[in-house]
């Protein structure tokens, strides 16, 4: 194992792996304010690059529920209502860890796993190539 | 412990706050490909809500580096490249899960948290209040 | 304290199309995921789909996809379920419940709202 | 989707008795059961969650225990305000289903 002071008061680890495997409490600490206006907004919406949202369900993963996005349109929407081709929307992705029951159905093992989901849309110029 | 039916090749867990407190194997599994172009694209330059990416650490948090998008502007960029101010720029945020340690700077002690970041930005309409 | 206050009995023509509510409140609505139940004698309780407050997200039994639609307000924290083209056989309690997407379980359900078709 | 079979339907017992139901997936659903209490008139109540966590409040003689697809609710000493209909449901995966129900009578 790797020599870390011991800390009185922080669990014991035994686990030849250790510190790769370690405990986690799933009691999950809600670091946001409750009243942050940003997350209830409506912009899947109101954005030129709109989306709708999917639920992603897995019973092996921790969280079980993911909702993904996805750009209703390939071009963006202009003032008039219209889609402008000649802007692309496109999703807005980032890596986010989730946990993943290993080995399969225990209840209480679990694997970090690094998935990329799709949280929104935004409004890009497109890249031109221009032919030779 | 809990009774529960060994499921053979799991993990023991003794403790009594089981499944709450679970084993978590910290070695990264990565689901993505890593050739996905989304995830190395410039969209925070080609929006029509540009971001800028600040880093954000926590060393008692994992992962210890989170990356939060800030957007440039208050309005959005037109085709011209200057701010249409009727437009709005907008983080796009997203309830990720942290580690966090627990008791604090334990090396093998965590809980799970929930934390908001931003990802991108997007643009949207504004909400327009009518005074009567 | 949590609780899901859902609107009175309905009595409707076949046919017709009802809208049934669920008014939030003792939390942040736009967090948890409100889902909706049918009960009847005959077949017990059936999950009729799921509506995020807070994306506008929504996902439907396939048995329900085109009975049922689901939709929220967020100023009010108030969910609905409107059911189409009605028939006897949904006459039945309608419940809604709050689930907790990252715990994964459902912590509150409302009162119910008994729905009767009839001419 | 996952049916979720439960016995007995109806229970008629003596205050101070112990008591036993038990729900059946027809497919693994790991740890992902919560047990229900419902009275008349009023909403359900959860009782039970991850097979065999008592939820924040619920006197200790309501437990659960089990898990893949055989699950078990117990109430050690019943006491008359356990009046209830009691019903199981898998929240492993939609569409999200539930057992037919117990119906507990007191003597």
């Known amino acids: 194992g790797i020599a870390i002071p011991r800390n009185s008061g922080c669990p014991n680890s035994e686990d030849k792996n250790f510190p790769r495997t370690v405990m986690v409490n799933l009691n999950i600490h809600n670091r946001n304010t409750s009243t942050n206006p940003k997350r209830s907004s409506d912009y899947y919406n109101r954005s030129t690059s709109p989306w709708n949202l999917h639920r992603n369900e897995d019973p092996e993963r921790y969280p079980s529920v993911i909702w993904e996005a996805k750009c209703r349109h390939l071009g963006c929407v202009k003032a008039d209502g219209n889609v402008d081709y000649h802007m692309n929307s496109v999703p807005i992705q980032q890596e986010i860890l989730v946990l993943r029951r290993e080995p399969r159905h225990c209840p209480n093992s679990f694997r970090l796993e690094k998935i990329l989901v799709s949280v929104g849309c935004t409004c890009v110029t497109p890249i031109v190539h221009h032919v030779a | 412990g809990i009774a529960i039916p060994r499921n053979s090749g799991c993990p023991n867990s003794e403790d009594k706050n089981f499944p709450r407190t679970v084993m978590v194997n910290l070695n990264i599994h990565n689901r993505n490909t890593s050739t996905n172009p989304k995830r190395s694209s410039d969209y925070y330059n080609r929006s029509t809500s540009p971001w800028n990416l600040h880093r954000n650490e926590d060393p008692e948090r994992y992962p210890s580096v989170i990356w939060e998008a800030k957007c440039r502007h208050l309005g959005c960029v037109k085709a011209d490249g200057n701010v249409d101010y009727h437009m709005n720029s907008v983080p796009i945020q997203q309830e990720i899960l942290v580690l966090r340690r627990e008791p604090r700077h334990c090396p093998n002690s965590f809980r799970l948290e929930k934390i908001l970041v931003s990802v991108g930005c997007t643009c949207v309409t504004p909400i327009v209040h009518h005074v009567a | 304290q949590v609780q899901l206050q859902q609107s009175g009995a309905e009595l409707v023509r076949p046919g017709a199309s009802v809208k049934l509510s669920c008014k939030a409140s003792g939390y942040t609505f736009s967090d948890y995921e409100i889902h909706w139940v049918k009960q009847t004698p005959v077949h017990g309780l059936a999950w009729i789909g799921v509506?995020?407050?807070?994306?506008?997200?929504?996902a439907y039994n396939q048995k329900f996809k085109d009975k049922a639609t689901l939709t929220a307000d967020k100023s009010s924290s108030t969910a609905y379920m409107e059911l189409s083209s009605l028939t006897s056989e949904d006459s039945a309690v309608y419940y809604c419940?709050?689930?907790?997407?990252?715990?994964?379980?459902?912590?509150?359900w409302g009162q119910g709202t008994t729905l009767t078709v009839s001419s | 989707s996952i049916v979720m079979t439960q016995t007995p339907k109806f229970l008629l017992v003596s205050a101070g008795d112990r008591v036993t139901i038990t729900c059946k997936a027809s497919q693994s659903v790991n740890n992902d059961v919560a047990w229900y209490q419902h009275k008349p008139g009023q909403s359900p109540k959860l009782l039970i969650n991850y097979a065999s966590n008592r939820y924040t409040g619920v006197p200790d003689r309501f437990t659960g225990s089990g898990y893949g697809t055989d699950f078990t609710f117990t109430i050690s000493t019943v006491q008359a305000e356990d009046l209830a209909i009691y019903f199981c449901q898998q929240d492993y995966g939609s569409p999200y289903t539930f057992g037919g129900g117990t119906k507990l009578e007191i003597k």
């Open positions: 509506i995020h407050p807070g994306n506008g997200g929504t």
């Open positions: 419940e709050r689930f907790l997407t990252y715990e994964g379980y459902f912590d509150y």
